[in-house]
Interface confidence: medium
Amino acid sequence: SGTTNTVAAYNLTWKSTNFKTILEWEPKPVNQVYTVQISTKSGDWKSKCFYTTDTECDLTDEIVKDVKQTYLARVFSVPWRNSTHGKETLFGTHGEEPPFTNARKFLPYRDTKLGQPTIQSFEQVGTKVNVTVEDERTLVRRNNTFLSLRDVFGKDLIYTLYYWKSSSSGKKTAKTNTNEFLIDVDKGENYCFSVQAVIPSRTVNRKSTDSPVECMGQEKGEFRE
């Protein structure tokens, strides 16, 4: 049989952050190559990463077409053949379908992880500080422009701010439905800030990792009386 020497892929894993989406699997190929197929529940299968010796396939271009769709993916193990025309690959022999493994369903809007946010700036005016979170670009496109995280998630996305006096470790928190915080601070005190993106309606992957810490008295901030 043409498929006797092929090993089915296993440990299929979706790795997705801010919609950059890669399907990974094992094992490293020996005498075989892989082809990945992706489809929506109601759509046709589309082949990607033809006859690759990699154990990953970037499916971002497909899933960003509609991040609210549910996607199915599968990885075919295809025997590697030598022929008179040099190295060729065949989708099985005698019309056989090579072995494949299904990935779990992937719903980008629900499953993509939130990337680490970045504090764009902070500005102090008297005893108030305005902290602005960068509205990151995603790879989701509309009208030839890349949409931001806020564009895609709308009001489903909030940010949590952690802030504390440089001289102490007691953290306070604030939340915002936009990309800005306005918080009260003690005059004459320096504060440090870190933010986290959150989608409260999710059950998994609700929170991003914390942003890098930014502290007052460093370049990123601005002070006004």
Epitope: V64, K65, D66, V67, K68, V140, R141, R142, L147, S148, R150, D151, V152, F153, G154, K155, T176, N177, T178, N179, E180
Partner: antibody, heavy 124, light 108 residues
Framework: QVQLQQWGAGLLKPSETLSLTCAVY????????WSWIRQPPGKGLEWIGE???????RYNPSLKSRVTISVDTSKNQFSLKLSSVTAADTAVYYC??????????????????WGKGTTVTVSS | EIVLTQSPGTLSLSPGERATLSCRAS???????LAWYQQKPGQAPRLLIY???SRATGIPDRFSGSGSGTDFTLTISRLEPEDFAVYYC?????????FGGGTKVEIK
Amino acid sequence: QVQLQQWGAGLLKPSETLSLTCAVYGGSLSGYYWSWIRQPPGKGLEWIGEIGASGSTRYNPSLKSRVTISVDTSKNQFSLKLSSVTAADTAVYYCARDTPYYYEGGYYYYMDVWGKGTTVTVSS
Amino acid sequence: EIVLTQSPGTLSLSPGERATLSCRASQSVSSSFLAWYQQKPGQAPRLLIYGAYSRATGIPDRFSGSGSGTDFTLTISRLEPEDFAVYYCQQAGVVPYTFGGGTKVEIK
């Protein structure tokens, strides 16, 4: 066809609390945000705040300390309370539906259904 | 907050003419969250355009929106008698959601 019907006291004295209610007919509260907007006589529109069916709120920071917006899903209505009113709060108050429309990878937001407005006058 | 500045304050035109209304934001606004409304005396505002370019249901195609970033435009290609009203732009991307001061389109 969704319609918003609003009511509440039209004449208040300074320091009193303004209280308005907006009922949603022909549709559900769920899946939308519900806003209050006001318009002082001869002036432009000012957004006061909004509430989701789940009760999550967003307020205009300039009014936040005085505003409470609440929702009653059993009655399919939402309400506005504005405390410690002054003459500067005299306005026509509108309720509106803020629709999240998802299309081609992202959301649009717009107020597509409005109440007819309630005139509120604050005078001693 | 994002300040929306509309110009001109008043536009005096005749029926059949073209009206061009400007809305300038104090900082960049996602076009997804930019809308235009029409208001006639004694009435609630009425949605015309959402997402900066898309016409709301039932809005005639003489109304069109354009622009991005900080500059947005509402164009009425040929004014009809019922188009004389006040027009507001609005952003719903950053709290507080804000409206422009309005442009009154009046009969010349």
